[in-house]
């Protein structure tokens, strides 16, 4: 019983429960394939508890293994649109620091209009995650169709 | 060592580990797009630890941020079936209380026969989640093809 | 404060934080549909903390409910390739002990070149998970396109 009380009094941050769920803010200018994200209760159901946004990109604040997940839906899309504009590809990676740059997760749309996936990956404090959408098709900004998030799982 | 023993003696509920994984029970009558779920060890590998079922819909018992995931496979389906019956769409949302009604997750099948996704979202005690499948195609009841679950992640 | 220190001194294993993320090593010989996995920091971003590999298949070391996730991308693939070679199917299941053999997760590629999904499932110490890819198409070995992992969620 004492343990349960102690646990409740501990700040959640000390338990390492960093978590974020973001919604699409906007796409970049023509030569910039990055998606720009936003989060916070004023915007709806998005939030950041631990990680931060740096110019629309997600920056990690705690070392550990994270579950990274994403769903992106194309805004104006049918199976014929998707195949005619192929390849349209979504990649999630560490984009800074440059020394740690790597692609973590990559999917192509082919004849579909939505991609969704998730993976476990080690991330370090200061890692910035970028989500690159290559191709000419635009993503939907609907919050139930396009979202991106991370969840700290263990040290 | 004492801490480890204490932890094991604590009821899991006090740690907030609410979790559920459901299998499809049946679809609704003609004008009802909802999927009706079931869970429990007698049914196979489905279970409810914390959340409850209310007339086949999942009701949350603990406030917090949850990972919600779903996979739905159409029962008699090929890429031509899926495109001919387009749009077939799956939406997961809070359907009650009405004041909190919102779509959390939405995917269309286009030329595919399976959708699968996941997201982090805040849920409150009493929220009921509904999964709406719109269109004329029926979902598979195979437990490895169609399932729906939630996992409490943090307060 | 004492609790936080105690928690940090505890071996993570006692908290039940078993987790693994694997990358594709190779496919099996002609009559063997299994994918063979590998993991470890020397290989990149894959790892095993708790579970072990047994001849390229993942063996569970701790009873509990796990989140199992997978993404498989076909190596030389377009929507026409995928539909021409249909059915290409990926199934994740318990393959040993034989008494517990069951399919946990199943997806077909149809006209897509990537499948990705996740589910919660109870697993027991000694369960070995196999991932069967049926059909003639080969999976990509790119670590951002094909991966398989588990995360212990609760007892």
């Amino acid at each position: 019983q004492r343990f349960a009380q102690a646990q409740q009094q501990l700040p959640l941050e000390s338990l390492g429960w960093d978590v974020a769920e973001l919604q699409l803010n906007h796409t970049g200018p023509q030569q910039d394939p990055r998606l720009y994200w936003q989060g916070g209760p004023a915007l709806g159901r998005s939030f950041l508890h631990g990680p931060e946004l740096d110019k629309g990109q997600l920056r990690i604040h705690r070392d550990g293994i994270y579950m990274v997940h994403i769903q992106v839906t194309l805004a104006i899309c049918s199976s014929t649109t998707a195949s005619r504009h192929h390849p349209t590809t979504l990649a999630v990676g560490i984009c800074s620091p440059a020394s740690r740059s790597i692609s973590l997760l990559r999917l192509s749309f082919h004849q579909g209009c939505t991609i969704a996936s998730q993976r476990l990956t080690p991330l370090a404090r200061g890692d910035t995650l970028c989500t690159n959408l290559t191709g000419t098709l635009l993503p939907s900004r609907n919050t139930d169709e396009t979202f991106f998030g991370v969840q700290w799982v263990r040290p | 060592q004492r801490f480890a023993q204490a932890q094991q003696q604590l009821p899991l509920e006090s740690l907030g580990w609410d979790v559920a994984e459901l299998q499809l029970n049946h679809t609704g009558p003609q004008q009802d797009p909802r999927l009706y779920w079931q869970g429990g060890p007698a049914l196979g590998r489905s279970f409810l630890h914390g959340p409850e079922l209310d007339k086949g819909q999942l009701r949350i018992h603990r406030d917090g941020i949850y990972m919600v995931h779903i996979q739905v496979t159409l029962a008699i389906c090929s890429s031509t079936t899926a495109s001919r019956h387009h749009p077939t769409t799956l939406a997961v949302g809070i359907c009650s209380p009405a004041s909190r009604s919102i779509s959390l997750l939405r995917l269309s099948f286009h030329q595919g026969c399976t959708i699968a996704s996941q997201r982090l979202t805040p849920l409150a005690r009493g929220d009921t989640l509904c999964t709406n499948l719109t269109g004329t195609l029926l979902p598979s009841r195979n437990t490895d093809e169609t399932f729906f679950g939630v996992q409490w992640v943090r307060p | 404060q004492r609790f936080a220190q105690a928690q940090q001194q505890l071996p993570l294993e006692s908290l039940g934080w078993d987790v693994a993320e694997l990358q594709l090593n190779h496919t099996g010989p002609q009559q063997d549909p299994r994918l063979y996995w590998q993991g470890g920091p020397a290989l990149g971003r894959s790892f095993l903390h708790g579970p072990e590999l047994d001849k390229g298949q993942l063996r569970i070391h701790r009873d509990g409910i796990y989140m199992v996730h997978i993404q498989v991308t076909l190596a030389i693939c377009s929507s026409t390739t995928a539909s021409r070679h249909h059915p290409t199917t990926l199934a994740v299941g318990i393959c040993s002990p034989a008494s517990r053999s069951i399919s946990l997760l199943r997806l077909s590629f149809h006209q897509g070149c990537t499948i990705a999904s996740q589910r919660l499932t109870p697993l027991a110490r000694g369960d070995t998970l196999c991932t069967n890819l049926t059909g003639t198409l080969l999976p990509s070995r790119n670590t951002d396109e094909t991966f398989f992992g588990v995360q212990w969620v609760r007892p």
């Epitope: 803010n25 906007h26 796409t27 915007l43 709806g44 900004r141 | - | -």
Partner: nanobody, 116 residues
Framework: QVQLQESGGGLVQTGGSLRLSCTAS????????GNWYRQAPGKQRELVAI???????NYADSVAGRFTISRDSAWKALYLQMNSLKPEDTAVYFC??????????WGQGTQVTVSS
């Protein structure tokens, strides 16, 4: 309350052209995207064209190569140039502006009828 107002609809013969305009009754700040939707009788509302704050555009398959979306620099107006019109383009056309903070502004719609 800001209102959007469409104009430029009407009756036109197959192969003809129309230019739809959409103007705001007040100032809308931080616009992320301008969109044109259409709704034909008995059908769902369909997104036909998008223009982003950065100037990127996308079109539905059914109108690509025939329709062009544009805007003025201050987002005071949104336009849809429709060429080579077909009977299947007959619908009520709605303009929509969405802000970065997820507010949505809609017009009342303008009827476009293409006769054969």
């Amino acid at each position: 309350q800001v209102q959007l107002q469409e104009s430029g609809g009407g009756l036109v013969q197959t192969g003809g052209s129309l230019r739809l305009s959409c103007t705001a009754s007040g100032s809308i700040f931080d616009i992320a995207r301008g969109n044109w939707y259409r709704q034909a009788p008995g059908k769902q509302r369909e997104l036909v064209a998008i223009i982003t704050s950065g100037g990127a555009t996308n079109y539905a398959d059914s109108v690509a190569g025939r329709f062009t979306i544009s805007r003025d620099s201050a987002w005071k107006a949104l336009y849809l140039q429709m060429n080579s019109l077909k009977p299947e383009d007959t619908a009520v056309y709605f303009c929509n502006m969405e802000t970065f903070s997820y507010r949505n502004y809609w017009g009342q719609g303008t009827q476009v009828t293409v006769s054969s």
